[in-house]
Interface confidence: low
């Protein structure tokens, strides 16, 4: 589900770029990191793909977007939105946010300044 952004992006906007890339590897990579060796999480078989492979796939996808603070923030916000309902408690939400904010550095991208991940209307 896409959050309400209050406008339609034009053809080169970040929103359009975020729509175009596959953020699933990023979501799975972060879930793997916060779940560790726990049971498989929901529909993800977190043992099916090595975490380093998922991270590489995630970075490859993010690399398809322009490396600007705005676009990176949009991507992180969308990942948060996509996974929000799957996060079981407040601690898990905070862990997910922490890992999410570390993602750009893991991929050798610039981290967005003060990217607000509280975009889910209070659900997360």
């Amino acid at each position: 589900m896409r959050r309400e952004r209050g406008r339609q992006g034009d053809s080169s906007s970040c929103e359009r770029q975020v729509d175009r890339v596959n953020l699933k590897p990023c979501e799975q990579h972060i879930m793997q990191r916060i779940m560790g060796e726990q049971e498989q999480y929901d529909s993800y078989d977190i043992r099916s793909t090595r975490s380093s492979d998922q991270q590489q796939r995630c970075c490859d996808e993010l690399n398809e977007m322009e490396n600007t603070q705005r676009c990176m923030c949009e991507a992180l916000q969308q990942i948060m939105e996509n996974q929000c309902d799957r996060l079981q408690d407040r601690q898990m939400v905070q862990q997910f946010k922490r890992e999410l904010m570390n993602l750009p550095q893991q991929c050798n991208f610039r981290a967005p300044q003060r990217c607000d991940l509280d975009v889910s209307g209070g659900r997360c």
């Epitope: 959050r3 309400e4 952004r5 209050g6 406008r7 339609q8 992006g9 034009d10 080169s12 906007s13 970040c14 322009e66 490396n67 600007t68 603070q69 705005r70 676009c71 923030c73 610039r110 967005p112 300044q113 003060r114 607000d116 509280d118 975009v119 209307g121």
Partner: antibody, heavy 118, light 107 residues
Framework: EVQLVESGGGLVQAGGSLRLSCVAS????????MNWVRQAPGKGLEWVSH????????YYADSLRGRFTISRDNAKNSLYLQMNSLRDEDTAVYYC???????????WGQGTLVTVSS | DIQMTQSPSTLSASVGDRVTITCRAN??????LAWYQQKPGKAPKLLIY???TLEGGVPSRFSGSRSGTEFTLTINSLQPDDFATYYC?????????FGGGTKVEIK
């Protein structure tokens, strides 16, 4: 025609408070992000604050956070800036401005002058 | 925060001149840059956005270009109405930053 009309400016003592308003017309206000930008006399433009269409996300300039509060009432097509603990350096013309669908700031109000005297 | 360095701060020119104003970002902002014109006592007016896209109703003598983190506003054949102050603004982040402004005055 897009119109943004600011009000609420005036002379205020240092340490005082003021609430600025901006009434929008000519576009779908409830679907637009908005900014406040200010300009001290004879100086350049300085961004103050940003608010998304649903008020879900708000940003402030570092130097103003904690003293200024941006808000909006979509039912009234209105944007607000509550300014507390005002200082001499807050003296400026305050503009409200619309953020376009392509992210840039496209329409500006005529501005309202805030003068802080010590 | 992203810093925008605009030059020159003042520019003296004559009607008919070709004028160039430069703005440099201290880090990548892609094409997220706008140019504004402001006259004394008036609100800024949008001229160009996305580095090179002319806003509707703006005369074609205004143009913008980008080379990496350096952006240029060019006014071909300066008109009497063009004497004003010009600002660049980055919007790569929500925390907008403006250049210091360039005052174009009559030589």
């Amino acid at each position: 025609e897009v119109q943004l009309v600011e009000s609420g400016g005036g002379l205020v003592q240092a340490g005082g408070s003021l609430r600025l308003s901006c009434v929008a017309s000519g576009f779908k206000f409830s679907g637009s992000m908005m900014n406040w930008v200010r300009q001290a006399p004879g100086k350049g433009l300085e961004w103050v604050s940003h608010i998304t269409s649903s008020s879900a996300t708000i940003y402030y300039a570092d130097s103003l956070r904690g003293r200024f509060t941006i808000s909006r009432d979509n039912a009234k097509n209105s944007l607000y800036l509550q300014m507390n603990s005002l200082r001499d350096e807050d003296t400026a013309v305050y503009y409200c401005a619309r953020v376009s669908s392509s992210w840039h700031t496209d329409y500006w109000g005529q501005g309202t002058l805030v003068t802080v005297s010590s | 925060d992203i810093q925008m360095t605009q030059s020159p701060s003042t520019l003296s020119a004559s009607v008919g001149d070709r004028v160039t104003i430069t703005c440099r970002a201290n880090q990548s902002i892609s094409h997220w840059l706008a140019w504004y014109q402001q006259k004394p006592g008036k609100a800024p007016k949008l001229l160009i956005y996305k580095a090179a896209t002319l806003e509707g109703g703006v005369p074609s003598r205004f143009s913008g270009s980008r080379s990496g983190t350096e952006f240029t506003l060019t006014i071909n054949s300066l008109q009497p109405d063009d004497f004003a102050t010009y600002y660049c603004q980055q919007y790569d982040t929500y925390l907008l930053t403006f250049g210091g402004g360039t005052k174009v005055e009559i030589k």
